[in-house]
């Protein structure tokens, strides 16, 4: 037998040299188109499994559509057709709850997860016999990646999971289930950097290959918690790197969130957005923010994939994604997943498993509305999924798509046989569709969130809400003392409230000066390498919030260090969340805050607020009677009529849907 | 920029009526659709009524169907409401509230509203 060479072992403390054989055919060779069906038994730790898997129907798309750039720095938009791809999801014969994400494209490559571990598979290199390598999860040897919490932390998390005996997978499932029994989508986008791209040869179908193995991943994990991963975007920077990524992981971030909101959004809409980089910072696997999967300026994150293996990588994304997902921290916390450690861990340990708190934190942020971009299934031209008629994403060619038969039978739109809309149906799914028919225009599909906002109505002819739309940036709002910023009112009062609720209140000016000049955990400009900045005087209005008149101590699931500092008469109240070095600070004063007059807080930086490209006179363009939205269109108040709120009418834009029932005139305003 | 200040609340028996008034300032308050909130102690504020700015329409919460009815003078820049067959689940505090982009038919699902007055008390108690 061929033996391994040094490469492809030396991460491993422990392996086996297998050769699975398939069950379904004769030979080994799949003919291609690949089944959609397969079976194999392989053997492990000198035990046979015989495994069933079943093409992963909602991964990848009709359309499949892969960003790249030439030479000149040209966006190239391709379609490569990828229709029998060649990644499968499955479980194992006669092991309760166990779940496999296998690739079948040149060998068997992928995850199986039992009972009580996880096994990783891949071909021999140079093997002429199918001969496969096999191993435990466990056995694969990471380097020690921070995110913020001291070993010490990590270490007493990990005895104490030792100690105590975990509730089985299958209760936390039956558990999960309970709590959590709507399918979630999470629509999102991969952007892989150069140095990547490089690494991998600049060969840009391995780089595809390679991130449609780890969406199948991320998947499986995901699936526990009833949530399914649809990749519907891929991004090579094939012609070098479009941000700046020189600095610590959160200036990385910051950048790359910045240009997801300002070009990658409006090429293909997405719930969140992970960087996949080459570069390292100094021991930190990856970093994003918490709760954000639905914000257009928040929802991404970015992710370490240096000299470790994909599978090994699967769980890096997987963290950072919980992240946005409102996933904080396990450490700390009496959390259990049936394992050592929980993908939630911050010492990036390498977890197949979300834990019983990570299923908590998801649900709060969905009983919080913080995940409501997640209830819509695909569009047919948005999901990445070869076309199946009963895989419940609406693919290319379907009109609807109610899942499985018994499924179908609850289904009063959607003909299940043929993914059609029954005879007497407009629609069958959508904010804007109710008992198969499309809701009057006029109906309201999505309030204000804030006086920043704009709401949207339904047309009357799709099934679909309006875009969402807000206020342009840089519009006035508390009554001249802020800024709107992506649809939200910056000022400090708001954020002391958020966090130390409804009576607190921004501390005076002095108190952000004494506290942010120190450059600590408790007062600072932001992280530069190793260490907290210094706020110069400044700057100092856009480090940590500093808030007054505290009468609530803040609970995120998290408990935070909170610090007093007596200044001049006050206390000034400062917290740190502890979320670790993969999260920024949601104690920091939020972008977008008015920091003095016509000045607002970018970057932990006072800047001008013409850096926000407030472009809108309201007067002019909207004749005083609306507000410019941020497809920069008026927006007019009830009582005018777009485009332009000058003559008498009912309110709304040309972007919101009409904003009464023409039909209806009962219902006019 | 509106301000609103509510006034009429009070202490009445059950079965007994009340009638709340809201005082709008500001040159746009004729054209915005207004509505009456409540907050009961510990329970989350709830929409009870709606009037579009030309009066022709109103919308009510199903509870307080037959027994409340909202008014509006736009020459006084005033909105009433009328309580009737007051009862004991009908105590909180009352809120006038109003936003530049909300009609009257969503005033109660819009989720974030422009203005607010402060709040008049209604407690309804033998």
């Known amino acids: 037998a061929a033996r391994p060479g040094f490469q492809q072992t030396s991460h491993l403390s422990s392996y086996e040299i297998i050769t699975p054989w398939r069950l379904t055919r004769e030979r080994r060779e799949a003919p291609r188109p690949y089944s959609k069906q397969v079976s194999y038994v392989i053997q492990a730790e000198g035990k046979e499994h015989i495994i069933h898997l079943e093409r992963n129907k909602d991964l990848l798309p009709e359309d499949f559509v892969v960003y790249t750039y030439n030479k000149e720095g040209t966006l190239i938009t391709d379609h490569p057709n990828i229709q029998n791809h060649c990644h499968y999801r499955g479980y194992v014969e006669g092991v309760h709850n166990s779940s496999i994400a296998l690739s079948d494209c040149f060998g068997l490559r992928g995850l199986l997860h039992l009972e009580n571990a996880s096994y990783g598979i891949e071909p021999l290199q140079n093997s002429s016999h199918f001969e496969h390598i096999i191993y435990r999860m466990d056995d694969v040897y990471k380097e020690p990646l921070k995110c913020g919490v001291s070993n010490k932390d990590i270490e007493k998390e990990t005895a104490k999971d030792e100690e105590e005996e975990p509730p089985s997978m299958t209760q936390l499932l039956r558990r999960r289930r309970a709590v959590l029994p709507q399918t979630r989508y999470v629509e999102l986008f991969i952007v892989v950097d150069k140095e990547r791209y490089d690494m991998m040869g600049r060969n840009q179908t391995a780089v595809r290959e390679e991130m449609i193995l780890l969406a199948n991943y991320l998947d499986s994990m995901y699936i526990m918690l009833n949530i399914r991963i649809v990749l519907v975007g891929l991004e090579i920077w094939t012609n070098g790197n479009l941000i700046n990524i020189v600095g610590g992981a959160g200036d990385v971030l910051g950048n790359f969130v910045q240009w997801r909101e300002k070009f990658l959004i409006t090429r293909r809409r997405h719930d969140s957005a992970q960087l996949v980089l080459k570069k390292g910072f100094g021991g930190t696997a990856g970093m994003a923010f918490v709760g954000t999967v639905c914000s257009r300026s928040h929802a991404g994150g970015i992710n370490v994939f240096g000299q470790i293996t994909v599978e090994t990588f699967a769980s890096i994304v997987a963290h950072e994604l919980g992240h946005n997902l409102g996933m904080n921290h396990d450490d700390g916390r009496d959390c259990s997943c049936g394992a050592k450690s929980c993908i939630m861990n911050s010492g990036a340990s390498g977890s197949r498993n979300f834990s019983s708190c990570s299923a908590e934190d998801f649900e709060k942020l969905t009983l919080n509305k913080g995940g409501n971009c997640l209830l819509n299934i695909p569009k047919p031209d948005e999901a990445y999924s070869a076309p199946s008629c009963g895989n419940k994403l609406v693919d290319a060619g379907e009109e609807c798509d109610c899942g499985t038969p018994k499924e179908c039978e609850l289904d009063p739109c959607c003909e299940g046989s043929t993914c059609k809309l029954k005879s007497f149906a407009e629609c069958a799914y959508g904010d804007c569709c109710k008992d198969c028919r499309f809701l009057p225009g006029g109906t309201l599909c999505r309030g204000k969130t804030s006086e920043c906002d704009v709401p949207e109505y339904c047309n009357g002819s799709s099934q679909f809400c309006q875009p969402d739309v807000f206020i342009q940036n840089g519009y006035p709002c508390q009554n001249n003392k802020a800024y709107c910023y992506n649809g939200m009112c910056q000022y400090y009062d708001a954020q002391c409230q958020v966090i130390f609720g409804s009576k607190a209140k921004a501390a005076p000016k002095d108190c952000f000066i004494e506290v942010n000049s120190k450059g600590d955990r408790f007062g600072n400009c932001g992280f530069s390498g190793n260490e907290y900045k210094k706020c110069a005087t400044g700057n100092a209005l856009c480090g940590k919030l500093q808030c007054e008149n505290v009468q609530e101590i803040p609970v995120f699931g998290i408990v935070p260090a909170i610090i007093q500092t007596p200044s001049r008469g006050t206390k000034c109240w400062g917290v740190d969340f502890q979320l670790g070095s993969d999260v920024p600070d949601p104690g920091m004063v939020n972008e977008g805050t008015k920091c003095g007059a016509g000045k607002i807080c970018r970057n932990f930086q006072c800047v001008d607020a013409s850096v926000l490209n407030y472009d809108c006179d309201v007067q002019k363009k909207c004749h005083g009677h609306g507000v410019c939205n941020s497809n920069k269109n008026c927006h007019c108040e009830n009582g005018w009529a777009p485009p332009n709120c000058e003559t008498k009418g009912y309110g709304g834009s040309v972007d919101s849907g009409p904003t009464y029932n023409e039909m209806n005139t009962a219902l006019r305003d | 920029e509106v301000q609103l200040v509510e006034s009429g609340g009070g202490l009445v028996q059950p079965g007994g009526s009340l009638r709340l008034s809201c005082a709008g300032s500001g040159r746009t308050f004729s054209r915005l659709a207004m509505g009456w909130f409540r907050q009961a102690p510990g329970k989350e504020r709830e929409f009870v009524a709606a009037?579009?700015?030309?009066?022709?329409?109103?919308y009510y919460e199903d509870s307080v169907k037959g027994r409340f009815t909202i008014s509006r003078d736009n020459a006084k820049n005033t909105v009433y409401l009328q309580m009737n067959s007051l009862k004991p689940e009908d105590t909180a505090v009352y809120y006038c509230?109003?936003?530049?982009?909300?009609?009257?038919?969503?005033?109660?699902?819009?989720?974030?509203?422009?203005?607010w007055g402060q709040g008049t008390q209604v407690t309804v108690s033998s």
């Open positions: 009037i579009s700015w030309l009066a022709e329409t109103t």
């Open positions: 509230a109003s936003d530049r982009f909300a009609t009257a038919q969503h005033m109660g699902a819009m989720g974030s509203l422009d203005y």
